[in-house]
C-alpha cells in the first residue's frame, strides 16, 4: 500500500495505490483511491508512467481528456467514470502487454488540494494448474498442467503423507512455448504415486504462485486449485 500526500501550496490530499500484477493478454486494473470531492468537475486524474513521455490517461471536468495520451496506451485505458466522485481513480488497462510493466503515478487534483502515489505494476502470465491421474502411463502417475506462464516458473511437488520429501527425482517438468511466442504451457509429471494420499503441484514465478491439489483414494478423486498474486502491497 502506497499512500502519497500533496506538497503544494494548497492542502494535500491522501492518494492510495496498491502494487499489482497484470496477466498478459487479459485486462488489468491499476488501483488508486483518493479523498473524494463533492463536485466531479473539480476532480482531475492523471495517470503517468515512468519513462513514458505522454500521459497514460487523463480525466478532468467530468470526462476523459486524451489529447496528450501516449501512443502505447491508445484505445486501451479507461477510468470508472461513475466511481470517480466517490474517490476511485483506478484505471482499467485492456489487453495487458509485457511492456506495460513499470512504475505508474496516480496524480489527483481536487478542490481540497493535490496528491499522488506511485504503483509498481508487474506483468507476466499465470494460470490455474489442473492435476489429473494419467491413466495412459504404465505406473500410477499424476499429470499437472497449466496453460500460460511467464517468466518460466519453478514446479515443485509435495505430498501430505511424505511431508518434506523431495520429488524432483520422480518427476519430470517441461515447458512448451505457446503460439504467441511469449507464454508457455507447463506440464509436470509425477511418477510412483501411492493411493490414499494428497499430492500438490506448486507452480511459482516472481508474479504468482498457484497450487493444484489432488486427493486419490480407492473410491474417489478430489481436486482443488488456487492462485495467489505475490507482492500485492499498497502504497
Amino acid at each position: 500500500l502506497i499512500i502519497g500526500f500533496g506538497i503544494s501550496g494548497r492542502h494535500s490530499i491522501t492518494v492510495t495505490t496498491v502494487a499489482s500484477a497484470g496477466n498478459i493478454g487479459e485486462d488489468g486494473i491499476l488501483s488508486c483511491t483518493f479523498e473524494p470531492d463533492i463536485k466531479l468537475s473539480d476532480i482531475v486524474i492523471q495517470w503517468l508512467k515512468e519513462g513514458v513521455l505522454g500521459l497514460v490517461h487523463e480525466f478532468k471536468e467530468g470526462k476523459d481528456e486524451l489529447s496528450e495520451q501516449d501512443e502505447m496506451f491508445r484505445g486501451r485505458t479507461a477510468v470508472f467514470a461513475d466511481q470517480v466522485i466517490v474517490g476511485n481513480a483506478s484505471l482499467r488497462l485492456k489487453n495487458v502487454q509485457l511492456t506495460d510493466a513499470g512504475t505508474y503515478k496516480c496524480y489527483i487534483i481536487t478542490s481540497k488540494g493535490k496528491g499522488n502515489a506511485n504503483l509498481e505494476y508487474k506483468t507476466g502470465a499465470f494460470s490455474m494448474p489442473e492435476v489429473n491421474v494419467d491413466y495412459n502411463a504404465s505406473s500410477e502417475t499424476l499429470r499437472c498442467e497449466a496453460p500460460r506462464w511467464f517468466p518460466q516458473p519453478t514446479v515443485v511437488w509435495a505430498s501430505q503423507v511424505d511431508q518434506g520429501a523431495n520429488f524432483s527425482e520422480v518427476s519430470n517438468t517441461s515447458f512448451e512455448l505457446n503460439s504467441e511466442n511469449v507464454t508457455m504451457k507447463v506440464v509436470s509429471v509425477l511418477y510412483n504415486v501411492t493411493i490414499n494420499n494428497t499430492y500438490s503441484c506448486m507452480i511459482e514465478n516472481d508474479i504468482a504462485k498457484a497450487t493444484g491439489d489432488i486427493k486419490v483414494t480407492e473410491s474417489e478423486i478430489k481436486r482443488r486449485s488456487h492462485l495467489q498474486l505475490l507482492n500485492s502491497k499498497a502504497s
Epitope: 486524451l66 489529447s67 495520451q69 484505445g75 485505458t77 482499467r92
Partner: antibody
C-alpha cells in the same frame, strides 16, 4: 446528444480518390477515437481504421497504403481519404465512435455514405 | 487477422420463440465482442458490448454471453421488429473484425 454526420460524394471514378468528412457533436475529439467501417453490398462489416484522441492512427493493414485519416479538433471534424478506388470498393462507408475509451463496441454511427465506384 | 464466424447464416422463427445466434472467434478475444442489429437502409445499432453488457435502451429480451472464442446472442422471445440482420464484432486486437452476419426471418 452524441451525433456523427457524414458528407461526401456518392460516385467515384475508378482509380480516383474518395474523401468523406465526419462532423461530430455531443462529445470532444480529444476524448474519443473515431473509427471508419465499410459495408459492401450483401457483405459484412469491415473495419478500416481509427484516429485516436491524440491524433495518432491505426489502419487495417489491407488498406494502409491507400488510406489516410486526419482531424480538426476545433471544428469537430474527422477526414477520411482513400486513394485508387476500384469497383470492389463500392460500399457504404460509416464513421463510428466507441462506447468507452477502451473500445468495447461502436455505440454511435454516422448515417453512412453510399459510394459507388464506376466509370 | 481474427476471423469471426457467425452461424447460422439465416434462420426463420415464429414470434415468441427463443432465438440463439452464435459467433466464434478464430482465437481468444477475451470479452471484447459486441453485437449489432442492422435494419435495411439503416446504420448498425449496438445491442451488446463487452460480450454481455446490454447497451442503454436495448430491450432485456436481448442477452449476450460467452468469453474467449465462443459467444452467443439470445433473444428470449422474438418480436416482429427483431426481424433483420445481426452482426458480431471483436475489438480485442487489430484489425478489428466482424462476422458476416445472420439474417433473422419470420415464418
Amino acid at each position: 446528444q452524441v451525433q456523427l454526420q457524414q458528407s461526401g460524394p456518392g460516385l467515384v471514378q475508378p482509380s480516383q480518390s474518395l474523401s468523406i468528412t465526419c462532423t461530430v457533436s455531443g462529445f470532444s475529439l480529444t476524448s474519443y477515437g473515431v473509427h471508419w467501417v465499410r459495408q459492401s453490398p450483401g457483405k459484412g462489416l469491415e473495419w478500416l481504421g481509427v484516429i485516436w484522441s491524440g491524433g495518432s492512427t491505426d489502419y487495417n493493414a489491407a488498406f494502409i497504403s491507400r488510406l489516410s485519416i486526419s482531424k480538426d479538433n476545433s471544428k469537430s471534424q474527422v477526414f477520411f481519404k482513400m486513394n485508387s478506388l476500384q469497383a470492389d470498393d463500392t460500399a457504404i462507408y460509416y464513421c463510428a465512435r466507441d462506447i468507452t475509451t477502451i473500445v468495447e463496441g461502436f455505440a454511435y454511427w454516422g448515417q453512412g455514405t453510399l459510394v459507388t465506384v464506376s466509370a | 487477422n481474427i476471423v469471426m464466424t457467425q452461424s447460422p447464416k439465416s434462420m426463420s422463427m415464429s414470434v415468441g420463440e427463443r432465438v440463439t445466434l452464435s459467433c466464434k472467434a478464430s482465437e481468444n478475444v477475451g470479452t471484447y465482442v459486441s453485437w449489432y442489429q442492422q435494419k435495411p437502409e439503416q446504420s448498425p445499432k449496438l445491442l451488446i458490448y463487452g460480450a454481455s453488457n446490454r447497451y442503454t435502451g436495448v430491450p432485456d429480451r436481448f442477452t449476450g454471453s460467452g468469453s474467449a472464442t465462443d459467444f452467443t446472442l439470445t433473444i428470449s422471445s422474438v418480436q416482429a421488429e427483431d426481424v433483420t440482420d445481426y452482426h458480431c464484432g471483436q475489438t480485442y486486437s487489430y484489425p478489428f473484425t466482424f462476422g458476416s452476419g445472420t439474417k433473422l426471418e419470420i415464418k
